[in-house]
């Protein structure tokens, strides 16, 4: 019996075609994704093939204007226009609280959410009780297929799913599920989740019953053959790994953004076993036709966006310094005024212990592309902020050794005074550079605001100690020639649309004044 | 559980027809097709062809074509194969067995002799 | 027809001994090979799928690999219970077909 499995992951948002790089789309003719345009391909697939499950592993959510403005009401519209048949909860469906999750998507969902490791409590219980599920039973033609979800432990510390979600080790929650429906006869099993590739292998190899695993989380590539498009695979498309139990189990992503429809075919035997599985992720580039009526629904969706665009998110009362001139040289207060928003925007007051779990940021100078005007009344606009930040990146946390940290910030004026927008602007961070001496040895001081302390101060960064850093995804990739943060991050999970955390951080503060105060020396 | 049951040994005369039947259960019978195997006294096992059940669709081994005919009930979950034009080297033992061959039937016994 | 030979016919040996079988393909199966076991008295069973998974149920002693056209089937720590005959079936592409067996007998 074959089953072919149609599955995107960490689509954030990208809710229209974008360029290649997932950033918004200039030239249409080269444009890729979008909703409209995967609808094209599932329903030419749902055409011609007999037994076809449409799954997606999570963050729907966040990642362009359309969540910022219509807050995961438009995940589930679209969604739902699909008819996708499941999809399992990311860490990032809770960025605006449990609330954001239940009204908007949980509720008009017409297809199961699934997750087996989150374990709601207290008066939250009765309420989110049936809205999410641990796992689903779907009939596909003659047979049936049983899904279960699972969800990042660490979404706590990634997102907002406030007190009364407990978020369990995912193996030791998966595995009673699996049995639940091996007991009711269901023999061939998907996985479908958001924790990562690491993950999502591990799952393959240790939850007994489960054939195949469907991630997110990571954004990983996978692909056999000569890969279409920019994007280094991982490994080849299905990833096999073999179980304790000794089976050959696929697993499988299909990177972000909705550039790509992740395309496996398993035939499974009577016993549900998994004879074979082959597939690739479908390139879903201008060659493919976007839906006329999908289309059409999004242009209209569309209109309440450009209004959004010009609305006053807040004030400022002081000049936005975000000239190249200035955050390519020194400290600039564009840069200050960012790096506070990311970290505000990663506060997490899980444990007694730590006043936060994060204290730091750095942001490369380069990205910040344009000041803002103080003497238009003040107001700050989303369309101000997208000339500031305008490559459609996310705000990311990492785990770094200290010993990379000050590889980083030699890095930053290693060739200082070129204009070059590897200078770092920072927050949490206080650092003296000497540029009379030579590249790689500028570096005198560093100080560091701890996180394990009720009152935060300033320590020396220790070289083996491993801190927690929030960044643009650009470093995070080792963009700006920062390729020791590629080469030597512990963790790196993915954050907020840049612009979203900067213009919450506004709404919030209603009236801003950043200024230059001795963080960079 | 999935169970095959096969019809009881036969015995035949060259140039006659045998029909063996396999009753499946324990699973979606229409999702799936049949194998059917022989084995000749002391040999090997052969593969003599498939069905899907669903469509009905068949294939053969080149070696049985023109002599082997399978169906399906899906009413009864059950699949036949018919072998005519018997000689004595098509005395063995013939088996039902699943899809990718994961559960057989216990065999049926066909004797050709005169 | 894809010709599947299968070495050696027979062998002899003890409990506990490590015992290979290898099957070699006519042409390239990818990984479309099963292993089963025939014990004396005609019952058949699946052993090994798609070339190296292993059935339920079925010892961790029994392993399968093997790519292309070469393919083996090892028994880690022969038991008296695997004292039987051990076919391939490639189903890459029709017709089946079976290697010719390998008969595993008690030194």
């Known amino acids: 019996w074959e089953l072919t499995i149609l599955h995107t992951n960490d689509v954030h948002s990208r809710l229209e075609q974008t360029s290649e790089d997932s950033s918004k789309c200039v030239n249409a003719s080269r444009c890729m994704g979008g909703v409209a345009r995967l609808f094209t391909k599932v329903q030419q697939i749902r055409r011609a093939e007999p037994n076809v499950l449409l799954l997606d592993a999570g963050d729907q959510y966040q990642g362009t204007i359309w969540f910022t403005v219509y807050k995961g009401a438009e995940v589930a519209h679209f969604m739902n226009a699909l008819r996708y048949d499941a999809m399992a909860l990311g860490n990032h469906e809770f960025d605006n609280g449990v609330e954001g999750l239940i009204e908007p998507l949980l509720k008009e969902a017409k297809f199961p959410i699934l997750s087996a490791n989150i374990k709601a409590k207290g008066p939250l219980a009765s309420q989110i009780s049936g809205l999410y599920l641990p796992y689903k039973v779907l009939p596909v033609g003659d047979e049936v297929v049983g899904i279960v979800g699972y969800t990042s432990k660490e979404t706590p510390f990634l997102s907002n799913p406030g007190t009364n979600l407990v978020f369990e080790d995912e193996i030791t929650a998966l595995q009673p599920e699996v049995d639940k429906l091996k007991t009711l006869n269901v023999n061939k099993i998907i996985a479908l989740g958001h924790s990562g590739f690491e993950m999502d292998k591990l799952i393959a190899q240790k939850v007994r019953g489960v054939d195949v695993v469907v991630g997110g989380h990571s954004n990983t590539f996978l692909y056999t053959g000569n890969p279409p498009s920019k994007e280094v695979p991982a490994g080849k498309y299905p990833f096999i790994v073999t179980s304790d139990d000794g089976r050959k189990v696929p697993v499988v992503q299909a990177y972000a953004f909705g550039k790509y429809l992740g395309y496996l075919k398993i035939e499974f035997d009577e016993r549900g076993n998994v004879i074979s599985s082959h597939g690739n992720p479908i390139l879903l580039n201008s060659s493919i036709p976007e839906d006329p009526s999908i289309k059409a629904d999004i242009n209209k969706w569309r209109i309440k966006l450009d209004n959004y665009s010009t609305q006053e998110l807040g004030k400022t009362i002081v000049y936005l310094d975000g000239s190249s001139q200035s955050c390519r040289f020194r400290e600039c207060n564009m840069g200050n005024l960012i790096c506070d928003a990311m970290i505000n925007n990663n506060l997490r007051h899980t444990d007694e212990m730590f006043w936060n779990h994060v204290s730091m940021c750095i942001l490369n100078g380069g990205g910040i592309r344009s000041p803002i005007d103080e003497r238009n009344n003040g107001t700050i606009t989303w369309e101000n902020l997208a000339a500031v930040l305008p490559f459609g990146g996310t705000f990311d946390l990492v785990q770094l050794k200290g010993s990379t940290l000050k590889k980083a910030f030699e890095h930053s004026v290693h060739r200082y005074g070129q204009s070059t927008g590897e200078f770092l602007q920072v927050g949490g961070i206080h650092v003296v550079y000497d540029l009379s001496r030579k590249p790689g040895d500028r570096v005198v001081k560093l100080d560091v605001l701890c996180t394990k302390c009720r009152v935060p101060s300033y320590d020396p960064l220790k070289m083996d100690e491993v801190y927690k850093v929030i960044l643009p995804n650009f470093l995070a990739n080792g963009g700006d020639g920062f390729q020791m943060i590629k080469d030597e991050l512990l963790r790196h999970d993915s954050g907020d649309q840049d612009i979203n955390v900067v213009s919450t951080y506004i709404s919030k503060m209603k009236v801003i004044y950043p200024a230059v105060e001795g963080r960079i020396k | 559980e999935v169970q095959l049951v096969q019809s009881g040994a036969e015995v035949k005369k060259p140039g006659a027809s045998v029909k063996v039947s396999c009753k499946a259960s324990g699973y979606t019978f229409t999702a799936y097709f049949m194998n059917w195997v022989r084995q000749a006294p002391g040999q090997g096992l052969e593969w003599m062809g498939r069905i899907y059940h669903n469509l009905g669709d068949t294939f053969y081994s080149q070696k049985f074509k023109g002599r082997v005919t399978m169906t399906v009930d899906k009413s009864t979950s059950t699949v036949y194969m018919e072998l005519s034009s018997l000689r004595s080297e098509d005395t063995a033992v013939y088996y039902c067995?699943?899809?990718?061959?994961?559960?057989w039937g216990q065999g049926t016994t066909v004797t050709v002799s005169s | 027809d894809i010709q599947m030979t299968q070495s050696p016919s027979s062998l002899s040996a003890s409990v506990g001994d490590r015992v290979t079988i290898t099957c070699r393909a006519s042409q390239d199966i990818g990984d479309s090979l099963n292993w089963l076991q025939q014990k004396p008295g005609g019952a058949l069973k699946r052993l090994i799928y798609a070339t190296s998974s292993l059935d339920s149920g079925v010892p961790s002693r029994f392993s399968g690999s093997g790519s292309g056209t070469e393919y083996t089937l090892t028994i880690s720590s022969l038991q008296p219970e695997d004292f039987a005959t051990y076919y391939c079936l490639q189903y890459a592409s029709f017709p089946w077909t079976f290697g010719g067996g390998t008969k595993v007998e008690i030194k």
């Open positions: 067995a699943t899809s990718y061959v994961g559960d």
